[in-house]
């Protein structure tokens, strides 16, 4: 069972400082951008990470949405990053969920962050390039220190 | 890097309660979880509980269910653990420690606070 | 009470290596995750493995830990005058819902 607390605004970065966005075809990739840049993107530079109460002893929830037009929040259904077109839910009755992320301070470094599946475990978010583009997607931990799977989080509020 | 500073040390008359405090500074303290552990004389660790402070409930071991109450306040970064109905048993060195990867890993530890229960 | 079953004691000459192992139920390590920490004398415990094989930065890859089934271990190579602490284990127990420690190994360095 998660149960939603507060939301915050984030902007989120890889450790090669590239910062995540959401395109014009909804697809979630990072790009080198200055802070002008960065502001001059929003709101697609701009996530809100929603935190949730967890009912078993598992780390901090989170759902991580965007707002342009409409609310998407992000989605790693069938091992697949996507943006959904919805609102975080108040409530999710159920122990894991495709929308739900444990947000991890890997120790020794509070400022670096993971995201695990709350439906695959030891699968992260990570970037990684594909052609000319780095995208957002979801990684067995295959390495130890797999810099790929770590994230500064900005707080925006 | 996050430091955890404990109060200092007590000596307690058995029946009593004790309270201790563990100040956090220096990185998130809301949602990150701070659990309570105890190391009496020559002994091994033991977890009493933990609380996750934006959620606001606590977790606590079934030995101490009833006894121990873990608290914290996010507007000083503080968490708080007593212990009630003391006992000679209870001497020990109590730690708090934070856990910001997952609640059962505990990556900070504060400098523990020894209480001594004895008439 | 101890649930985590860890050798009281074990010693080794420096430069060799050593294991501490650790064995639980499938309530506790068969189903969960395993962290050890380091206690030097006098002083609150250090992370010192997390995730069953994790290295937080600044713990020396002389340390490594490994899980299997319901057991796990911590190995230390290239063992050092420093080393000489208490070592636990420490798991979850869904039976007891709570977090479970083992009952500590000492090390001694010779």
């Known amino acids: 069972y998660f149960g939603k607390l507060e939301s915050k605004l984030s902007v989120i970065r890889n450790l090669n400082d590239q910062v995540l966005f959401i395109d014009q075809g909804n697809r979630p990739l990072f790009e080198d951008m200055t802070d002008s840049d960065c502001r001059d993107n929003a709101p697609r530079t701009i996530f809100i990470i929603s935190m949730y109460k967890d009912s078993q002893p598992r780390g901090m929830a989170v759902t991580i949405s965007v707002k342009c037009e409409k609310i998407s929040t992000l989605s790693c259904e069938n091992k697949i990053i996507s943006f959904k077109e919805m609102n975080p839910p108040d409530n999710i009755k159920d122990t894991k969920s495709d929308i739900i992320f444990f947000q991890r301070s890997v120790p020794g470094h509070d400022n670096k962050m993971q995201f695990e599946s709350s439906s695959y475990e030891g699968y992260f978010l990570a970037c990684e390039k594909e052609r000319d583009l780095f995208k957002l997607i979801l990684k067995k931990e295959d390495e130890l220190g797999d810099r790929s799977i770590m994230f500064t989080v900005q707080n925006e509020d | 890097q996050v430091q955890l500073v404990q109060s200092g040390a007590e000596v307690k008359k058995p029946g009593s309660s004790v309270k201790v405090s563990c100040k956090a500074s220096g990185g998130t303290f809301n949602s990150y979880a701070i659990s309570w552990v105890r190391q009496a004389p020559g002994q091994g660790l033991e977890w009493m509980g933990g609380i996750i402070p934006i959620y606001g409930t606590a977790n606590y071991a079934q030995k101490f269910q009833g006894r121990v109450t873990i608290t914290a306040d996010e507007s000083t970064s503080t968490a708080y653990m007593e212990l009630s109905s003391l006992r000679s048993e209870d001497t020990a060195v109590y730690y708090c420690a934070r856990a910001a990867y997952h609640p059962l890993v505990f990556d900070n530890w504060g400098q523990g606070t020894l209480v001594t229960v004895s008439s | 009470d101890i649930v985590l079953t860890q050798p009281p004691s074990v010693s080794g000459a420096p430069g060799q290596r050593v294991t501490i192992s650790c064995s639980g139920s499938?309530?506790?390590?068969?189903?969960?995750?395993v962290n050890w920490y380091q206690q030097l004398p006098g002083t609150a415990p250090k992370l010192l493995i997390y995730r069953n094989n994790h290295r937080p930065s600044g713990v020396p890859d002389r340390f490594s830990g490994s899980k299997s089934g319901t057991s796990a271990s911590l190995a230390i190579t290239g063992l050092q005058s420093e080393d000489e602490a208490d070592y636990y284990c420490q798991s979850w127990d869904y039976s007891g819902f709570s977090t479970v420690f083992g009952g500590g190994t000492k090390l001694t360095v010779l």
């Open positions: 499938s309530s506790n390590i068969g189903n969960h995750y």
